[in-house]
């Protein structure tokens, strides 16, 4: 697993370097998670032919994965910093149950899956410190999450692999959109 942000050898070797700003730390954290997702996607794609699945088939899924929409204020047109930040944090909180589902799903990248999960928790904390309107952030219901996780794990093998592929793809897209939006803040 890659070394988490702020723990690489360059940081140790350069004690006089300016500490990272909050925005830089968030940027670095997202890029670190995206690297982790790439490694997980690599294993998934090597294991099965899921990655060749058509966009149409993937669109017809029973999941309710977070997705950026125009109304969320994260796109260049109609950009709204506060609305967007709330959407990013809410979306990441909603992704947590899906990241839990990914645990124990990887043979050679087991540590990587755990790192993505833990780094996302840290990213949420960073972003919550940045947000002014924490009351607008809705936390998913733990009971609903528990039954969703049970339902996902009950699926047949092919469906589980499709679900894994879709979660990774959607999480990557969500993080990329978030990264672009956060760089405008």
């Amino acid at each position: 697993a890659p070394v988490p942000p702020g723990e690489d050898s360059k940081d140790v070797a350069a004690p006089h370097r300016q500490p990272l700003t909050s925005s830089e730390r968030i940027d670095k954290q997202i890029r670190y998670i995206l690297d982790g997702i790439s490694a997980l996607r690599k294993e998934t794609c090597n294991k099965s032919n899921m990655c060749e699945s058509s966009k149409e088939a993937l669109a017809e899924n029973n999941l309710n994965l977070p997705k950026m929409a125009e109304k969320d204020g994260c796109f260049q047109s109609g950009f709204n910093e506060e609305t967007c930040l709330v959407k990013i944090i809410t979306g990441l909180l909603e992704f947590e149950v899906y990241l839990e589902y990914l645990q124990n799903r990887f043979e050679s990248s087991e540590e990587q899956a755990r790192a993505v999960q833990m780094s996302t928790k840290v990213l949420i904390q960073f972003l919550q410190k940045k947000a002014k309107n924490l009351d607008a952030i809705t936390t998913p219901d733990p009971t609903t999450n528990a039954s969703l996780l049970t339902k996902l794990q009950a699926q047949n093998q092919w469906l589980q692999d499709m679900t894994t592929h879709l979660i990774l793809r959607s999480f990557k897209e969500f993080l990329q959109s978030s990264l672009r939006a956060l760089r405008q803040m």
């Epitope: 088939a57 029973n62 645990q103 047949n156 093998q157 092919w158």
Partner: antibody, heavy 121, light 111 residues
Framework: EVKLEESGGGLVQPGGSMKLSCAAS????????MDWVRQSPDKGLEWVAE??????????YYTKSVRGRFTISRDDSKSSVYLQMNNLGAEDTGIYYC????????????WGQGTTLTVSS | DIVLTQSPASLAVSLGQRATISCRAS??????????MNWFQQKPGQPPKLLIY???NQGSGVPARFSGSGSGTDFSLNIHPMEEDDTAMYFC?????????FGGGTKLEIK
Amino acid sequence: EVKLEESGGGLVQPGGSMKLSCAASGFTFSDAWMDWVRQSPDKGLEWVAEIRSKTYHPATYYTKSVRGRFTISRDDSKSSVYLQMNNLGAEDTGIYYCTRPRYYGGYFDYWGQGTTLTVSS
Amino acid sequence: DIVLTQSPASLAVSLGQRATISCRASESVDNYGMSFMNWFQQKPGQPPKLLIYTASNQGSGVPARFSGSGSGTDFSLNIHPMEEDDTAMYFCQQSKEVPYTFGGGTKLEIK
């Protein structure tokens, strides 16, 4: 050629135990999920238990009526799946089939011939 | 759990005619554009034999007179033309998720 062969059935008294075995051949067993399905005259076909391959968690699933009494296990080195049945009742009487769900679609494409369990005093 | 209601419980069809068996699921068995509904034929003293998988695909070596259709919660198995060898029990089964469930069965006979 895929083959599934069950063994271990017979007559057992209520409250007793029995262990069924299923020997598989003709496919990569360690990658496969394996299931037990039973059939009784009054209940028709009923799925009993499933054991999954590594990287799928939880690894075992059971139908409600057998949970806590039955245990499904596997030995990849022997290409075998087992069903340990404890505290048996008359309602467990039936033909027990070992079956394999196909990766694409999860349908049971191969079945063993079945082994009969009779629970009676 | 997904409950499968199969109808009719028994059916008598003349040789050469069409037999239609229905299966209704208590919730959708669809996902990713696929329907996880399967059909089995069973003759006395034999294990079930796969006829149709994922709603409309024929199992290996299954004659073309067997066809399946449907999506979501409503499915059907069609046998046309009916042959003597088709006298058997027929079951629908969902393979979307555990607990995998079966319909109660349809006994098909020749009229």
